[in-house]
């Protein structure tokens, strides 16, 4: 048993039929010694008396909020949560496996630049009785500080008949140098509690591997005289690291017809302009990627040819 | 994805082209190592990230762009020099700061070159003949070192008398390639910055 936060404890249980469970001793937080009784949740059934209560925790029926009372007055509470381990594997019932980039990916993280700021998100089909807390550090043996905000519900999506809820959190490395070469990964730990069930999820990554620039901005077309060609120009996104001559981007310019089946013309360039042929009803899209370290491409920025 | 090959203008900062070739060569070599050594721990997640230049050179700090010198987190490790202007020891007189940056890059290349050559000698003795270092990568390191135009003592190639442990050598190769790729990215950023200065 260990303390998750004040008055909230996690009991780790091997989960199999007829498992012996864990013996837990609860102590009433009071100077009183006599006349103390214990109850569980809203039930008025007295479970025991005395300053300590010993219970055998085997299943969810044994978890919940234990309260010690004296003469009708509440003295203290202890909330017991269960963390299930089946066949040596901790349960992952609360979050949805996003399966990208590989199976058993519950947390996904992205950074718009090298400032040490990043966003992580996760999915669940659970809508209520759900709390998350997020901690992060650089490295694990001698951890350096990363500060994370509160996890918030960032999107709701309908998937077939069911709703999916996306939660996200923003974190910032306390002292990040954008030019640094990372040798220790960022560790992100998410504690998830659904009713009386506790689970934890972790992700480990280098900022350089989760970079995804914002799309290029101010995408403009300038027709070239007496030609079907246009000059496409754009700018680095505002959120990208500076100086741009050090943190350079490379770009992909795509001309796409109305129909998805039409052949796409693609040009790669390190410049912030390109000359392409603009077909009728087509659109021109540009996306960006770190020029020197091939992490993710940005989303497309698009303009219609007309 | 292959980076587009830049054809440098004659007056262009001479090292940029070489640094781009270096990054391309090390990225290709790393990809080849990952594929060939698929049953070895060779991915970024699996390996220990070691830097053989640690405490010997200070490339990141010495080559820090002027704009980042206001960032205290970039200056915390040691007294830092930063690059201001200049070209790759071309005709103009290069500033002291600049020289420090470029000589640090040169020292990195020299250390990696020695490590890679030593390792290649071991890999050539492997009866499995599973993987060797790409001669192109070694050549590109050499070209960039020549373009940097520093004269420094040649480091003798390490020779080892004991029987090589080929498993450990291959894992060390992965560690080295990952670290060298990261350093090659930094070198490319620096050259790009200098080219724009």
């Amino acid at each position: 048993i260990w303390e998750l936060k004040k008055d909230v404890y996690v009991v780790e249980l091997d989960w199999y039929p007829d498992a012996p469970g864990e013996m837990v001793v609860l102590t009433c937080d009071t100077p009183e010694e006599d006349g103390i009784t214990w109850t569980l949740d809203q039930s008025s059934e007295v479970l025991g008396s005395g300053k300590t209560l010993t219970i055998q925790v085997k299943e969810f029926g044994d978890a919940g909020q234990y309260t010690c009372h004296k003469g009708g007055e509440v003295l203290s509470h202890s909330l017991l949560l269960l963390h299930k381990k089946e066949d040596g594997i901790w349960s992952t019932d609360i979050l949805k496996d996003q399966k990208e980039p590989k199976n058993k990916t519950f947390l996904r993280c992205e950074a718009k630049n090298y400032s040490g700021r990043f966003t992580c998100w996760w999915l669940t089909t659970i809508s209520t009785d759900l709390t998350f807390s997020v901690k992060s550090s650089r490295g694990s043996s001698d951890p350096q500080g990363v500060t994370c905000g509160a996890a918030t519900l960032s999107a709701e999506r309908v998937r077939g008949d069911n709703k999916e809820y996306e939660y996200s959190v923003e974190c910032q490395e306390d002292s990040a140098c954008p030019a640094a070469e990372e040798s220790l990964p960022i560790e992100v730990m998410v504690d998830a509690v659904h009713k009386l069930k506790y689970e934890n999820y972790t992700s480990s990554f280098f900022i350089r591997d989760i970079i995804k620039p914002d799309p290029p901005k101010n995408l403009q077309l300038k027709p070239l005289k007496n030609s079907r060609q246009v000059e496409v120009s754009w700018e680095y996104p505002d959120t990208w690291s500076t100086p741009h001559s050090y943190f350079s981007l490379t770009f992909c310019v795509q001309v796409q017809g109305k129909s998805k089946r039409e052949k796409k013309d693609r040009v790669f360039t390190d410049k912030t302009s390109a000359t392409v042929i603009c077909r009728k009803n087509a659109s021109i899209s540009v996306r960006a990627q770190d020029r020197y370290y091939s992490s993710s491409w940005s989303e497309w920025a698009s303009v219609p040819c007309s | 994805r292959n980076l587009p090959v830049a054809t440098p203008d004659p007056g262009m900062f001479p090292c940029l082209h070489h640094s781009q070739n270096l990054l391309r060569a090390v990225s290709n070599m790393l990809q080849k190592a990952r594929q060939t050594l698929e049953f070895y721990p060779c991915t970024s997640e699996e390996i220990d990230h070691e830097d053989i230049t640690k405490d010997k050179t200070s490339t990141v700090e010495a080559c820090l762009p002027l704009e980042l010198t206001k960032n205290e987190s970039c200056l915390n490790s040691r007294e830092t020099s930063f690059i201001t202007n200049g070209s790759c020891l071309a005709s103009r007189k290069t500033s002291f700061m600049m020289a420090l940056c470029l000589s640090s890059i040169y020292e990195d290349l020299k250390m990696y070159q020695v490590e890679f050559k030593t390792m290649n000698a071991k890999l050539l003795m492997d009866p499995k003949r599973q993987i060797f270092l790409d001669q192109n990568m070694l050549a590109v390191i050499d070209e960039l070192m020549q373009a940097l135009n520093f004269n420094s003592e040649t480091v003798p190639q390490k020779s080892s008398l004991e029987e090589p442990d080929f498993y450990k050598t291959k894992i060390k190769l992965c560690i080295l390639l990952h670290a060298f790729r990261i350093r090659a990215v930094t070198i490319d950023r620096v050259m790009s910055y200098l080219n724009a200065s």
Epitope: D41, Q42, E59, F60, G64, T125, I126 | -
Partner: antibody, heavy 117, light 107 residues
Framework: QVQLQQSGAELMKPGASVKISCKAT????????IEWVKQRPGHGLEWIGD????????NYNEKFKDKATFTADTSFNTAYMQLSSLTSEDSAVYYC??????????WGQGTTLTVSS | SIVMTQTPKFLLVSAGDRVTITCKAS??????VAWYQQKSGQSPKLLIY???NRYTGVPDRFTGSGYGTDFTFTISTVQPEDLAVYFC?????????FGSGTKLEIK
């Protein structure tokens, strides 16, 4: 002893609104969700939604989003459900119940609503 | 929303019989399933929570099992006082949904 006491039966005209109350005793009212459930003969039990009195946080079943409004008064340990624009479809028994971790563990006795012109 | 398909709708049994009711969720609800008993003219009463845990004071002839999508409620030896309608419910995610109910009648 936990108890939920609901307001009495109501006979309402179509188009009108009604407010059903649920007074809780015997536990910390602010810490437990109050659930509202509808039961019509032949339609089984339908969850309308819930309110956490301490924070005022609510969840509504999409189906009842424009029909029901939940409020709670922690000084009187009472939760309320207002049903608006009543039609004959709203004629049913409405229950309040408490929920923390173990399903709907305590139920009120039910309030019968009849909507008839 | 999650559909809880409860079978059978009716059960005609004799005292002492063993009774099994099943509930199938349209998607995984982990173990967040409760079973209720509703006697004629009364409010529902909680019998089982977290799929297999008996609520305080519930006789041990009532048991529940299951995980994910398939759940079972069993009365090992039916007593005359068990005449009632039994409902399953998922409280995994909102909207919380109930099964259609199983009416237990004693011969």
């Amino acid at each position: 002893q936990v108890q939920l006491q609901q307001s009495g039966a109501e006979l309402m005209k179509p188009g009108a609104s009604v407010k059903i109350s649920c007074k809780a005793t015997g536990y910390t009212f602010s810490s437990y969700w109050i659930e509202w459930v509808k039961q019509r003969p032949g339609h089984g039990l339908e969850w309308i939604g819930d309110i956490l009195p301490g924070s005022g946080s609510t969840n509504y079943n999409e189906k009842f989003k424009d029909k029901a409004t939940f409020t709670a008064d922690t000084s009187f340990n009472t939760a309320y459900m207002q049903l608006s624009s009543l039609t004959s479809e709203d004629s049913a028994v409405y229950y309040c119940a408490t929920r923390r971790f173990r399903g709907l563990d305590y139920w009120g006795q039910g309030t019968t609503l009849t909507v008839s012109s | 929303s999650i559909v809880m398909t409860q079978t059978p709708k009716f059960l005609l049994v004799s005292a002492g019989d063993r009774v099994t009711i099943t509930c199938k969720a349209s998607q995984s609800v982990s173990n967040d399933v409760a079973w209720y008993q509703q006697k004629s003219g009364q409010s529902p009463k909680l019998l089982i929570y977290y799929a297999s845990n008996r609520y305080t004071g519930v006789p041990d002839r009532f048991t529940g099992s299951g995980y994910g999508t398939d759940f079972t409620f069993t009365i090992s030896t039916v007593q005359p006082e068990d005449l009632a309608v039994y409902f399953c419910q998922q409280d995994y995610t909102s909207p919380f949904t109930f099964g259609s109910g199983t009416k237990l009648e004693i011969k």
